[in-house]
């Protein structure tokens, strides 16, 4: 039931571009005056185990233009992709490179989007049509969830439940790593 990443059929992948495009300057923005004193969503720690870093999830970046009908973004946006399986953190860094992947003997754990962020985009349209302003939904972070036997996206279960979210200041918006996402990694996504 949840939003599926990459539902937008028309995307152009540009792996060589790595930085987030700067959003247009915000107008009359008095956001800072209106912040919740401890505003924001705290980090999601899905694993309430002895060692939070015991399991890990691969986050890839790639850059593309976004489209809305015949209109295309003036600048590309950098997207985060949650890739493949979840496994012990110590195995993950080399796992893809060696073509190996850690698989749990029990239930299947999947790396899926956790938080989302908005990015303002201006869309340029053909035929003299007025430009459009939109806010695109991008993945901000990934998490591991357990697939139930139905293997249905709506049946993904959290590794652990999260307590009531205190309003602690957090910005989940990730800064871009210099991301040259290679195609093999992209094919592993989701």
């Amino acid at each position: 039931q949840g939003w599926q990443a990459f539902k937008n059929d028309a995307t152009e992948i540009i792996p060589e571009l790595g930085e987030y495009p700067e959003p247009p300057p915000e107008l009359e923005n008095n956001k800072t005056m209106n912040r919740a004193e401890n505003g924001g969503r705290p980090p999601h720690h899905p694993f309430e185990t002895k060692d939070v870093s015991e399991y890990s999830c691969r986050e890839l970046h790639f850059t593309r233009y976004v489209t809305d009908g015949p209109c295309r973004s003036a600048k590309p946006v950098t997207e985060l992709v949650c890739s493949g399986q979840c496994g012990p953190a110590r195995l993950l860094p080399n796992a893809i490179g060696r073509g190996k992947w850690w698989r749990p003997s029990g239930p299947d754990f999947r790396c899926i989007p956790d938080r989302y962020r908005a990015q303002r985009v201006q869309l340029l349209c053909p035929g003299g049509e007025a430009p459009r302003a939109r806010k695109v939904r991008l993945v901000a972070s990934c998490k591991c969830k357990r697939l139930t036997r139905f293997h249905n996206q709506s049946e993904l279960k959290d590794f652990g439940t999260e307590a009531a979210r205190p309003q602690k200041g957090r910005k989940p918006r990730p800064r871009a790593r210099s991301a040259k996402a290679n195609q093999a990694e992209l094919e592993n996504a989701y």
Epitope: Y116, A133, K135, R137
Partner: antibody
Framework: EVQLVQSGAEVKKPGASVKVSCKVS????????MHWVRQAPGKGLEWMGG????????IYAQKFQGRVTMTEDTSTDTAYMELSSLRSEDTAVYYC??????????????WGQGTLVTVSS | QAVVTQEPSLTVSPGGTVTLTCGSS?????????PYWFQQKPGQAPRTLIS???DKHSWTPARFSGSLLGGKAALTLSGAQPEDEAEYYC?????????FGGGTKLTVLG
């Protein structure tokens, strides 16, 4: 399809606090951007605050700064809006509203049924 | 804080056309204010008609359209129906802070 169900009507005395809940179904709360809007009897809509996904922070309207707190319990997919130091002019219907979790952010697409809060001595 | 202005009331005949406008005290309304339009009938929660200046929703009747006109956001109703009688609110985004207009009471004179 996102659905929002709010808690029932409340009657409060001036100076008290009220906490209104908004239960999300169809999606998880972390996929959505939740906002709160109120409407005094016979008056217009007034934005109180909400989660800004551009920088991951909750923003409150200046008018309510220091009196309102918006929180979320992601284990139950329930959002809360607490308003303190109530006065008679806070008597209103309080709505939660969220986006539709689509590819483009469209805020205020889905609305709760509203919670009437009456402040009276 | 910005003030968002709307006509307090407008009247249209069935089948007629009417345009509601939404202005900002800070200057011209642009696409970067992501104008929204809502319809509210007595005793009901509001419902979104238009997002991001001109983007209709699956439930928005084709007779409603959004645009920018002369430095304001505009909602045009072409071919008014009796069921369109309602209060209409616009909403502007000031970089994450939102402000509603005071609302326009639209009467469809039968």
């Amino acid at each position: 399809e996102v659905q929002l169900v709010q808690s029932g009507a409340e009657v409060k005395k001036p100076g008290a606090s009220v906490k209104v809940s908004c239960k999300v179904s169809g999606y998880t709360l972390t996929e959505l951007s939740m906002h709160w809007v109120r409407q005094a009897p016979g008056k217009g809509l007034e934005w109180m605050g909400g989660f800004d996904p551009e920088d991951g922070e909750t923003i409150y309207a200046q008018k309510f700064q220091g009196r309102v707190t918006m929180t979320e319990d992601t284990s139950t997919d329930t959002a809360y809006m607490e308003l303190s130091s109530l006065r008679s002019e806070d008597t209103a219907v309080y709505y939660c509203a969220t986006d539709s979790a689509g590819y483009w952010y469209k805020f205020f697409q889905h609305w709760g049924q509203g919670t009437l809060v009456t402040v009276s001595s | 804080q910005a003030v968002v202005t709307q006509e307090p009331s407008l009247t249209v005949s069935p089948g007629g056309t009417v345009t509601l406008t939404c202005g900002s005290s800070t200057g011209a309304v642009t696409i970067d204010h992501y104008p929204y339009w809502f319809q509210q009938k007595p005793g009901q929660a509001p419902r979104t008609l238009i997002s991001d200046t001109d983007d209709k929703h699956s439930w928005t009747p084709a007779r409603f359209s959004g645009s920018l006109l002369g430095g304001k956001a505009a909602l045009t109703l072409s071919g008014a129906q009796p069921e369109d009688e309602a209060e209409y609110y616009c909403l502007l985004d000031y970089g994450g802070t939102f402000v509603f207009g005071g609302g326009t009471k639209l009467t469809v004179l039968g």
